[in-house]
């Protein structure tokens, strides 16, 4: 059994304008250092599953085991925290599922369920069969450890019965939990034996104990809440994109770069070109050309469309993404075949060329200018 469990966002937030590049918030898994993590890729009918962490390919090693749709990390450390993705490659398409792993000393897990089942938790016992409090639905209490992203709603439940009907009170870290202990207070739904805290913040972290009692006895149950904090991060590119492509002379082709980013990213499509018959400048750095970049009024920069291609269009195309926080890049190759040859589907792989990570770039003029790889500067 995994030592953590996914927490779903149950808050209802006002509708916001769609964000062009943001993939929906990934699910959060939390584990304590030293524990073993096991995650199942929630994608169906996968022929091949590949894994990435923070956009970088994840392969097996002495602590990472990849078996079928399962990823297992032995002896987790805080360095294992990050944005993970599993990509299922099928015969006709591929799909990616994202999730966050947070390895923290404040271990937590669990999920918030809606009160759809409502009042069946409220057990009313008639007659003279006096009875001390007892739990009526222990399944809803199994997840003692709850990891919740900041600003979400948390619900703890202690469904109980007894005769007379027991009362319920809540403690935080062993002391009476008062409304004034948190901004916005909290709600207690006695009918549902639940405690609800909206818009949780880091100061809400701690142990929450429900005490259920009547004159014949008392029972209690403790939950641990960890509030997972979010900060903006550099862009992360979906593994496998852009994908290698091939087409015939005169054909059309599209490269797609899918970005996960909190902060809105700038996207640049860059191609290796020749200048005076050479692909490299005197300093050994490649000549590059910015084909397209995102700007305030640009069209969908995630897609680079090439129409009526010629043999000169063949080569490597780089998707370089940067936001206020940092950068990421991946590339793909275009093969242009003579017209009489029918193109075959290229194997979809993604290269992250080392020189993009190591070199400086320069781009300080128009979009179509060729520049030597020294510094790329943003000009909107």
């Amino acid at each position: 059994r995994p030592s953590f469990s996914l927490v779903e966002d149950t808050t209802l937030e006002p509708e916001e304008p769609p964000t062009k590049y943001q993939i929906s918030q990934p699910e959060v898994y939390v584990a304590a250092p030293g524990e073993s993590l096991e995650v199942r890729c929630l994608l169906k009918d996968a022929a091949v599953i590949s894994w990435t962490k923070d956009g970088v390919h994840l392969g097996p090693n002495n602590r990472t085991v990849l078996i079928g749709e399962y990823l297992q990390i032995k002896g987790a450390t805080p360095r294992d925290s990050g944005l993970y993705a599993c990509t299922a490659t099928r015969t006709v398409d591929s799909e990616t599922w994202y999730f966050m792993v947070n390895v923290t000393d404040a271990i937590s897990s669990g999920d918030d369920e809606d009160d759809t089942d409502g009042a069946e938790d409220f057990v009313s016992e008639n007659g003279n069969n006096k009875r001390a409090p007892y739990w009526t639905n222990t399944e809803k209490m199994e997840k003692r450890l709850h990891a919740v992203p900041a600003a979400n709603t948390v619900k703890f439940r202690c469904p109980a019965g007894g005769n007379p009907t027991p009362t319920m009170r809540w403690l935080k870290n062993g002391k009476e939990f008062k409304q004034e202990h948190r901004i916005g207070g909290y709600k207690v739904r006695n009918q549902h034996w639940s405690l609800i805290m909206e818009s949780v913040v880091p100061s809400d972290k701690g142990n929450y104990t429900c005490v259920v009692e009547n004159e014949y006895g008392s029972i209690n149950h403790t939950y641990h809440l960890d509030v997972v904090e979010r900060s903006p991060h550099r862009p992360i590119l979906q593994a496998g994109l852009p994908a290698n492509a091939s087409t015939v002379v005169g054909g059309d082709v599209e490269f797609v770069c899918k970005v996960y980013s909190d902060a809105q990213p700038h996207i640049q499509w860059i191609k290796h070109v020749e200048k005076n018959g050479s692909k490299y400048g005197p300093d050994g750095l490649p000549y590059l050309k910015v084909l397209k970049h995102s700007g305030i009024n640009s069209s969908n920069a995630e897609v680079l469309a090439l129409f009526n291609v010629t043999e000169a269009d063949a080569g490597e195309y780089i998707c370089k993404v940067s936001n206020y926080i940092g950068q990421a890049n991946q590339s793909a190759w275009l093969t242009v075949l003579p017209k009489q040859q029918a193109p075959g589907r290229e194997k979809e792989i993604t290269a992250s060329p080392d020189y993009l990570e190591k070199l400086e770039f320069r781009h300080d003029s128009g979009l179509n200018d060729i520049f030597e790889a020294q510094k790329i500067e943003w000009h909107e």
Epitope: T19, Q264, I296, Y324, G326, Q327, F361, K375, I376
Partner: antibody, heavy 113, light 108 residues
Framework: QVQLVQSGAEVKKPGESLKISCKGS????????IHWVRQMPGKGLEWMGA????????TYSPSFQGQVTISADKSISTAYLQWSSLKASDTAMYYC??????WGQGTLVTVSS | DIQMTQSPSSLSASVGDRVTITCRAS???????SNWYQQKPGKAPKLLIY???NLQSGVPSRFSGSGSGTDFTLTISSLQPEDFATYYC?????????FGQGTKVEIK
């Protein structure tokens, strides 16, 4: 913990050169832009430029282009802001910031004859 | 360059008050990239809100951000003694990443 530590206050004369530093620790230095921000006495914040230490990608505000140079040495997780010839109007507090969330304590530069 | 104009430039308020600061961009900031910072005298700025509406880790939930296009708002739902400071907006849509001129929140 994640932090940026800046070099100490400097008192210089007009025409002199200066290089101030910003050392990152507690995180992967190469994975985040380092931004430089100026705050003149009693005034607001002005974005000067940024560098991505992994590949030394730099960008400058037009107001500061040619006036300062931003550089980084990723081997020692340090970013720099330098002037070749200081002016009295360069007197200000200079902050470095990792992205938007982590800021250095600031370096006060005083240029006076 | 995109200019960011904050209003008011200063305001006086009491503990418990609801405070709203607005920032207007000189052109549409599509897609709504703005940060809000708090700065106290002699201290470095502190990030409160990123990308218009995301609360930064560790920032109290009384702070909230909203807006799109050209108009952005920072709201403090119930002003606390430690909130008296200067607040800045910043656009991070296109270079140069300009700041607003600041709004000083003082005790009434």
């Amino acid at each position: 913990q994640v932090q940026l530590v800046q070099s100490g206050a400097e008192v210089k004369k007009p025409g002199e050169s200066l290089k101030i530093s910003c050392k990152g620790s507690g995180y992967s230095f190469t994975n985040y832009y380092i931004h430089w921000v100026r705050q003149m006495p009693g005034k607001g914040l002005e974005w000067m430029g940024a560098i991505y230490p992994d590949n030394s990608d730099t960008t400058y505000s037009p107001s500061f282009q040619g006036q300062v140079t931003i550089s980084a040495d990723k081997s020692i997780s340090t970013a720099y802001l330098q002037w070749s010839s200081l002016k009295a109007s360069d007197t200000a507090m200079y902050y470095c910031a990792r992205g938007a969330d982590i800021w250095g304590q600031g370096t006060l530069v005083t240029v006076s004859s | 360059d995109i200019q960011m104009t904050q209003s008011p430039s200063s305001l006086s308020a009491s503990v418990g008050d609801r405070v709203t600061i607005t920032c207007r961009a000189s052109q549409d900031i599509d897609p709504y990239l703005s940060n809000w910072y708090q700065q106290k005298p002699g201290k470095a700025p502190k990030l409160l809100i990123y990308d218009a509406s995301n609360l930064q880790s560790g920032v109290p939930s009384r702070f909230s951000g909203s807006g799109s296009g050209t108009d952005f708002t920072l709201t403090i739902s119930s002003l606390q003694p430690e909130d008296f400071a200067t607040y800045y907006c910043q656009q991070t849509t296109s270079h140069p990443y300009t700041f607003g001129q600041g709004t000083k929140v003082e005790i009434k």
